[in-house]
Structures are given as C-alpha cells and as structure tokens.
C-alpha cells in the first residue's frame, strides 16, 4: 500500500532571465527511493539515480543544474519554460509517486502589475 505523500515547492512565478529551484519531498513512507526523474510535459530534464547519481538531458545541460538535494535548478529562464514540471519518485516497494509544480515565466514588463518575482 502506498502511504507516502509528495510535498513540492508550490507553483512559482518567476522573471525571464532569472533562475528558480524546483523541489519535491517524499514523506510518510519508509520506501527506498531508487530514482527521481524530473520531466516537463513529455520531456525528460534530469534523472537522479541512487546508485549512478545525476544525469542531465543533453538539450538542457546549459540551463539545468542538479540539486539542491533531489531538486533541480533552472537557469536563464525563458517564457517558453512556462509549464508544468513533474518530479517522479521511483521507490521500492511502494512504486511511483508524482509531484507537480507549475512554473510561470513572465516578461520583466509584467512587473508593472505588481507581481512579486522570485529570483534566488
């Protein structure tokens, strides 16, 4: 029985050119995490394997950095990065847990609306 829950950073609004951290945390289970996949739509961004470590997809190598922890740092954000990101936890013996984070990347001019941008 799958008892775990995934907590995420929550949805994020950020400014074009900035960087953000996507993080998920699996709790309420003793299952062993064997691998975490980070995906956007149907694209694989990165894998963190318990034995093999990190692998960043070649097309994202310039803008994606592993960590902190099992999280992912997205840099040099573009408006095209707007979308839903998935952290997929592969565990044993529970199976797969998925967390979802929506990232909205805005042009700087939108700051006129008073939106508070997050740039770590």
């Amino acid at each position: 029985m799958m008892t775990g829950t995934i907590e995420t950073t929550g949805n994020i609004s950020a400014e074009k050119g900035g960087s953000i951290i996507l993080q998920c945390h699996l709790s309420s289970t003793t299952a062993q995490v064997t691998q975490v996949n980070w995906e956007q739509q149907d694209q694989l961004l990165a894998i963190c394997n318990a034995d093999l470590g990190w692998h960043i997809s070649p097309s994202f190598k310039d803008r994606v950095a592993p960590g902190p922890g099992l999280g992912l740092t997205l840099q040099s954000l573009t408006v095209n990065d707007t979308g839903e990101y998935f952290c997929i936890y592969h565990t044993y013996p529970d199976g797969t847990y998925t967390g979802r984070i929506f990232l909205e990347v805005l042009e700087s001019s939108v700051a006129e609306h008073g939106a508070r941008f997050q740039i770590p």
Epitope: T9, N11, T82, G83, E84, Q118
Partner: antibody, heavy 119, light 112 residues
Framework: EVQLQQSGPELVKPGASMKISCKAS????????MNWVKQSHGKNLEWIGL????????SYNQKFKDKATLTIDKSSSTAYMELLSLTSEDSAVYYC????????????WGQGTSVTVSS | DVVVTQTPLSLPVSFGDQVSISCRSS???????????LSWYLHKPGQSPQLLIY???NRFSGVPDRFSGSGSGTNFTLKISTIKPEDLGMYYC?????????FGGGTKLEIK
Amino acid sequence: EVQLQQSGPELVKPGASMKISCKASGYSFTGYTMNWVKQSHGKNLEWIGLIIPYNGGTSYNQKFKDKATLTIDKSSSTAYMELLSLTSEDSAVYYCARGFRGYFAVDYWGQGTSVTVSS
Amino acid sequence: DVVVTQTPLSLPVSFGDQVSISCRSSQSLTNSYGNTYLSWYLHKPGQSPQLLIYGISNRFSGVPDRFSGSGSGTNFTLKISTIKPEDLGMYYCLQGTHQPWTFGGGTKLEIK
C-alpha cells in the same frame, strides 16, 4: 476591453463527445494562460485545467485528464475544450477564464456554456 | 489535492452590515519563495464570476475598497464592510499554489 466569448448551450446524448469554444479579444492571446472551470448544480466550482497559448503546454486536474482535452487556435485567438464520453455527471456550466499573470488566479471569465447530457 | 474549506455556507445579512468569510486550506498556501496564491471571487446570479482579491489582499481593478482580504498559511478571510445590494451572491476562494488549483465550496451572501 478583454472579452471571452463562448459557444452556445449544448444538449448531447450520453456517450457522445463535444467541443466548446472560447474566442478571446482585447488582449494578446498568447501572453496569458486560458483556464477552464466546471460549475455543477449551480454551485461547486472545479478547475479542469489550463493551456498555455504561447507554447501549447497544458496542465490538467487529474480528475478531468480522461474527460477533457484542451487545445487552441492561435490564428483565431480561440481556445477549445473537448469533452469526451459524456455522462449525466458532465451536465454543468463550463467557463473559460483568462489566467492572471503572476498570481495563479483568473481575472476575466467567459459567459459560460451550459451542457446537458440526456438521452 | 489541497482541500479548501469555506465557512459559513450561508450568510444572511442586512444592508450596511459588515461580514467576514473564512477560507481554510488543508496545507500551507505559501510557496518556497514566500508567495501565497489565494484569490476571492463573487458570482452573482445570471453573471460570470468576477475577481475581487488576488494574492491574499490585493484588490483587483475596479473593486470597491469595502472588500478586503487577509490571512496567511492556511487561514484566510474576506471582509466586506457596509454590505450593498450589488454584493449579494456566491463568494468563492481559490488556491493556486498547488496543482491542481482548488476552490472553496462557496458562501452564499443573502438578505435576512
């Protein structure tokens, strides 16, 4: 002036599929997400999902993942929601609503499309 | 999914009254960068819903200052001072911090 004009009411048979349109005007269509909301029994509101006109990306409430398909036609600034394999549970008013940038909310709503599923 | 609980379900008022509507979430609506995405809407009979408050406490353009929002974390409040006839209808809160977005069950503001 921001306007979202939805297609008219529909009476459809169980098992059928249908598509609702939402024509946007008065703003840059590709600059804002388009959200869809279901209102059942004149009360409860449920977020179905959104589409990003800029890149075609979508985000669905998993409850509606196999029920609704969101698409857009950039050339006509129109968003569409197709409802699949309709049952009486799908009888409701459906709204399109423009995303409010930077705040994960919606600021302008269409007038709603009433869908009645009945044999 | 985040459960959003609104109270009361029904709120009988007299014109000129001040009222509060509460919205509570099953988990914190503050994201890792300190932003909280909680908005309020009014749905009048025969109309589309309209945005009143976004980001907890920001009034949308054209919304009278008798509407105010407050709160943090999991507890939020919409206050309406000096109720007017055009304020009657269903009020909903919406959390947009976590996927999927979820609405409160609604509060009906009606005349006593």
